[in-house]
Interface confidence: medium
């Protein structure tokens, strides 16, 4: 912590500008008014203060707002956000999506830090649910965001938000997460026609039950092997050879290459050899 010293004559900062980068830490502490800093926070991001100097500026804001910063200051924190601890952020009440975007922009290109995770948690809890605009924003910055949530947290995602989800946002989701998301997706896309519906629901199918897979097999969807391999084993096992053949269409030949991997391996073992032979792929049950 910087000790309190009087500001040298003529050094009192009338505004936040680039001349301050040449101030020593004790001069920043003594000569920059905290209230002035708070009202001109938008300028700080355009000034290349060193991290040591940013520590001083943060200290001044902490003294001015011991209960947590107001959103008017938070929105303009810029690089100073990188100096905040999760404990600091837990004191904030962030309600504006613009504020969230501004702070995520600062951390752009880096993996999610504890600060960012805390910020997002505060924001989502404040909103009560993960609405479409928020999800849109979060997945744009962190494609893996959705899959970082627990099934319990995902249960608060309204079906309308599912429209914001892109296939790559689900790449790292496990079956438990897809079990929660699939019914929401099914509800969200229910009014779409067959082929359009399949395009949208495809990346969520790792959470689909057997009856839905059976229904899809009647719609000439031509599911690719990559999607098939992500289906729940327990959902695939009851499917007949004819149903799998209809589900995969021309991609059925790919089963041979995957015959040693789940769920294909387990499914093959459940089928009658006569039925498997009808595929002409040499699959051995």
């Amino acid at each position: 912590e910087v000790e309190k010293t009087a500001c040298p004559s003529g050094k009192k900062a009338p505004e936040i500008d680039e001349s301050l980068i040449f101030y020593k830490k004790w001069e920043l502490e003594a000569c920059v008014d905290a209230a002035l800093l708070a009202t001109q926070m938008d300028r700080v991001n355009a000034i290349p203060f060193t991290y040591e100097q940013l520590d001083v500026l943060k200290h001044k804001l902490d003294e001015l707002y011991p209960q947590g910063y107001p959103e008017s200051v938070i929105q303009h924190l810029g690089y100073l956000f990188l100096k905040m601890s999760p404990e600091d952020i837990r004191k904030w009440n962030v309600t504006s999506l613009e504020t969230l975007k501004a702070l995520l922009e600062v951390n752009k290109g880096h993996e999610m830090s504890p600060q960012v995770a805390t910020l997002i948690d505060r924001f989502v809890k404040g909103r009560g649910q993960l609405d479409k605009d928020t999800l849109d924003t979060l997945t744009a910055f962190y494609p893996g965001y959705l899959c970082s949530l627990s099934p319990e947290e995902l249960s608060s995602v309204p079906p309308s938000s599912i429209w914001a989800v892109r296939p790559q946002d689900l790449d790292t989701c496990d079956p438990r997460q897809l079990d929660v998301l699939y019914p929401k997706a099914r509800l969200a896309f229910q009014n779409m026609n067959g082929s359009e519906y399949f395009v949208k629901i495809q990346s969520f199918l790792g959470g689909a039950p057997t009856e839905d897979l059976k229904a899809l097999s009647q719609q000439n969807v031509s599911m690719d092997l990559a999607t098939f391999m992500k289906l729940r084993t327990d959902a695939v096992l009851p499917l007949t050879v004819a149903e799998v053949q209809k589900l995969l269409g021309p991609h059925v030949e790919g089963l041979k290459a995957e015959e040693r991997h789940r769920p294909v391996r387990d499914w093959i073992l459940r089928q009658r050899q006569d039925d498997l032979d009808t595929l002409g792929l040499g699959l051995q049950g």
Epitope: E18, F22, K25, A46, P48, T50, Y51, E52
Partner: antibody, heavy 121, light 107 residues
Framework: QVQLQQPGTELVKPGASVKLSCKAS????????MHWVKQRPGQGLEWIGH????????NYNEKFKSKATLTVDKSSSTAYMQLSSLTSEDSAVYYC??????????????WGTGTTVTVSS | DIVMTQSQKFMSTTVGDRVSIICKAS??????VAWCQQKPGQSPKLLIY???NRYTGVPDRFTGSGSGTDFTLTISNMQSEDLADYFC????????TFAGGTKLEIK
């Protein structure tokens, strides 16, 4: 990948000026401050100053305030440094360097290829 | 201005050696120090930042340590490709300043 391309050499006469360029590629030019550094043989490196490509803001080492002028051209992602009233003391290699900061660090992560300025009549 | 000093301008070494290069700051700079390597005719390359963090792609034989005013760059198993100039730089306060550097040479 991130690159900062500088012309290799500049031969100038004493008293003249020279404008050095630093063309950035492989990243968003306006997202990072650009610094300039002087290196004379056997004398280490000296920080000249930096410019903020997003708004053209500049800061100079007091020692170089009357020597260097930093500018940027966003449209071509190029930073410039003009050196004036050149003397033999200004003969050196001049580097541009990108300044990066993240959640707990800051540093020059990429240096330009360097321009050798020779002041000679 | 903060003065950075590397008192050894040259160091003789052999392949396999453990080499320590020392850098001193004229005042406390915390951990705001970086180490760079520069080979003849080339631009400097970042090795260590924040005094002790190895930059991406830098071999783990390079380590940085220290804080406050005393900093050390250590090469644990000297290789022939490590023959170069090494310099430290502070970014605790402006103007940013560099030490004169240490040139590693073969004995």
């Amino acid at each position: 990948q991130v690159q900062l391309q500088q012309p290799g050499t500049e031969l100038v006469k004493p008293g003249a000026s020279v404008k050095l360029s630093c063309k950035a590629s492989g990243y968003t030019f306006t997202s990072y401050w650009m610094h300039w550094v002087k290196q004379r043989p056997g004398q280490g490196l000296e920080w000249i100053g930096h410019s903020n490509p997003s708004n053209g803001g500049t800061n100079y080492n007091e020692k170089f305030k009357s020597k260097a002028t930093l500018t940027v051209d966003k449209s071509s992602s190029t930073a410039y440094m003009q050196l004036s009233s050149l003397t033999s003391e200004d003969s050196a290699v001049y580097y541009c360097a990108r300044w990066v900061r993240g959640s707990n660090y800051e540093y020059f992560d990429v240096w330009g290829t360097g321009t050798t300025v020779t002041v000679s009549s | 201005d903060i003065v950075m000093t590397q008192s050894q301008k040259f160091m003789s070494t052999t392949v396999g050696d453990r080499v320590s290069i020392i850098c001193k700051a004229s005042q406390n700079v915390g951990s705001a120090v970086a180490w760079c390597q520069q080979k003849p005719g080339q631009s400097p390359k970042l090795l260590i930042y924040s005094a002790s963090n190895r930059y991406t792609g830098v071999p783990d034989r390079f380590t940085g340590s220290g804080s406050g005013t005393d900093f050390t760059l250590t090469i644990s198993n000297m290789q022939s490709e490590d023959l170069a100039d090494y310099f430290c730089q502070q970014y605790s306060s402006y103007p940013l300043t560099f030490a004169g550097g240490t040139k590693l040479e073969i004995k």
